[in-house]
């Protein structure tokens, strides 16, 4: 059987944030469907999103099994209504994805400032430790659990009345900064993995300012 009505997928792209990982590709199908395969650690091909008319496939469940592994996927093209059809060489048309190593490449999601508390001239700022879909012993691991000390946070803070920013860094999810008494400050944080070569930084968190309900003030 021929493949006259099928075209190979192209522009295969990994979209991954905090290990939530989707493979995207083109084109939109016309009279054809797609099936995705992903290689596991034994280099076996596992079928996902069989016979889909979507141009994306959520592969999170597979990649979280070992985030340090380097995965490869491929998208197979079949004529609509005949997922068993093969090309002239006895194989469906397929296109390979780039390799993808989740630990090194997943984007760091936008962090959130969980709380800030002022005690005198010190402010303790805590960053929310976001839960990922990576599991160990039947529990979901947080971003810190997965990345450990590879992950740092940068805090940007400034007086509400001025634009001059200061920065602090931490290897944990907490900061303790000095502030001027009687001044309100605004805060934003960024997640960073300094050892990476790509996707080193997240976008900045939403800005939180003192005098709003997220904070707490104590003399």
């Amino acid at each position: 059987s021929g493949t006259t009505n099928t075209v190979a997928a192209y522009n295969l792209t990994w979209k991954s944030t905090n290990f939530k990982t989707i493979l995207e590709w083109e084109p939109k199908p016309v009279n054809q469907v797609y099936t995705v395969q992903i290689s596991d650690r034994s280099r076996n091909w596992k079928y996902k999103c069989t016979g889909t008319t979507d141009t994306e496939c959520d592969l999170t469940d597979e990649i979280v099994k070992d985030v340090n592994w380097t995965y490869e996927a491929r998208v197979l093209s079949y004529p609509a209504g005949n997922v068993e059809s093969t090309g002239s060489a006895g194989e469906p048309l397929y296109e390979n994805s780039p390799e993808f190593t989740p630990y090194l490449e997943t984007n760091l999601g936008q962090p959130t400032i969980q709380s800030f508390e002022q005690v005198g001239t010190k402010v303790n700022v805590t960053v929310e430790d976001e839960r990922t879909l990576v599991r160990r012993n039947n529990t979901f691991l947080s971003l810190r659990d997965v990345f450990g000390k590879d992950l740092i946070y940068t805090l940007y803070y400034w007086k509400s009345s001025s634009s001059g920013k200061k920065t602090a860094k931490t290897n944990t999810n907490e900061f303790l900064i000095d502030v001027d008494k009687g001044e309100n400050y605004c805060f934003s944080v960024q997640a960073v993995i300094p050892s990476r070569t790509v996707n080193r930084k997240s976008t900045d968190s939403p800005v939180e300012c003192m005098g709003q309900e997220k904070g707490e003030f104590r003399e």
Partner: antibody, heavy 125, light 108 residues
Framework: QVQLQESGPGLVKPSQTLSLTCTVS?????????WSWIRQHPGKGLEWIGE???????RYNPSLKSRVTISVDTSKNQFSLKLSSVTAADTAVYYC??????????????????WGKGTTVTVSS | EIVLTQSPGTLSLSPGERATLSCRAS???????LAWYQQKPGQAPRLLIY???SRATGIPDRFSGSGSGTDFTLTISRLEPEDFAVYYC?????????FGGGTKVEIK
């Protein structure tokens, strides 16, 4: 007060696997610290082997990575070191240590502030 | 890897004297990640200084650390008999964490 105690065989044959355990007492292994292994060759300086977080997240010295496995058992409050294919060059005093966050300049950074007494491992047939 | 070079290898001094120990890094190290340890014969190392200049809990104020970038210094203002030991600098910012080769402070 947290204390660490290394245990394991003092003599290992060449090509075998060195296995050591560090027992944490006086505190929980799951309390936000990291746990490290360091060794010191006879009369020499210190060499960091690797570290683990209670979640199982590890970092290893690249020079030893192919031979090293560090694991944690939170139920026993222990963490362990396995070093495979040992040679005489692996003869050393092996220390376990706790990495604790210390405040510095607005943030918190980890330092090895509690160490075990060390255990001597000799590789010899 | 970041190589830390300590000098001198041995420092021969008398009690009451000032000791100045140097640690030079092969590439820049953030002060946040620089520590000093003391080790006595048959004992494990003990954390003295973290963040290049902050004293660890229980460390006497005769110990002080300074420096930034690639050059760091540990100073013992007046040597006490219990200070004669080997001192190591360590960086914990880049894997592998590395230690200097050590400086032995001995009684003259």
């Amino acid at each position: 007060q947290v204390q660490l105690q290394e245990s394991g065989p003092g003599l290992v044959k060449p090509s075998q696997t060195l296995s050591l355990t560090c027992t944490v007492s006086g505190g929980s292994i799951s309390s936000g610290q990291y746990w490290s292994w360091i060794r010191q060759h006879p009369g020499k300086g210190l060499e960091w082997i690797g570290e683990i977080y209670y979640s199982g997240s590890t970092r290893y010295n690249p020079s030893l990575k192919s031979r090293v496995t560090i694991s944690v058992d939170t139920s026993k409050n222990q963490f362990s070191l396995k070093l495979s294919s040992v040679t005489a060059a692996d003869t050393a005093v092996y220390y376990c240590a706790r990495d604790t966050p210390y405040y510095y300049d607005g943030g918190y950074y980890y330092y090895m502030d509690v160490w075990g007494k060390g255990t001597t491992v000799t590789v010899s047939s | 890897e970041i190589v830390l070079t300590q000098s001198p290898g041995t420092l021969s001094l008398s009690p009451g004297e000032r000791a100045t120990l140097s640690c030079r890094a092969s590439q820049s190290v953030s002060s946040s990640y620089l520590a000093w340890y003391q080790q006595k014969p048959g004992q494990a190392p003990r954390l003295l200084i973290y963040g290049a200049s902050s004293r660890a809990t229980g460390i006497p104020d005769r110990f002080s650390g300074s420096g930034s970038g690639t050059d760091f210094t540990l100073t013992i203002s007046r040597l006490e008999p219990e200070d004669f030991a080997v001192y190591y600098c360590q960086q914990v910012g880049v894997v592998p964490y590395t230690f200097g080769g050590g400086t032995k402070v001995e009684i003259k």
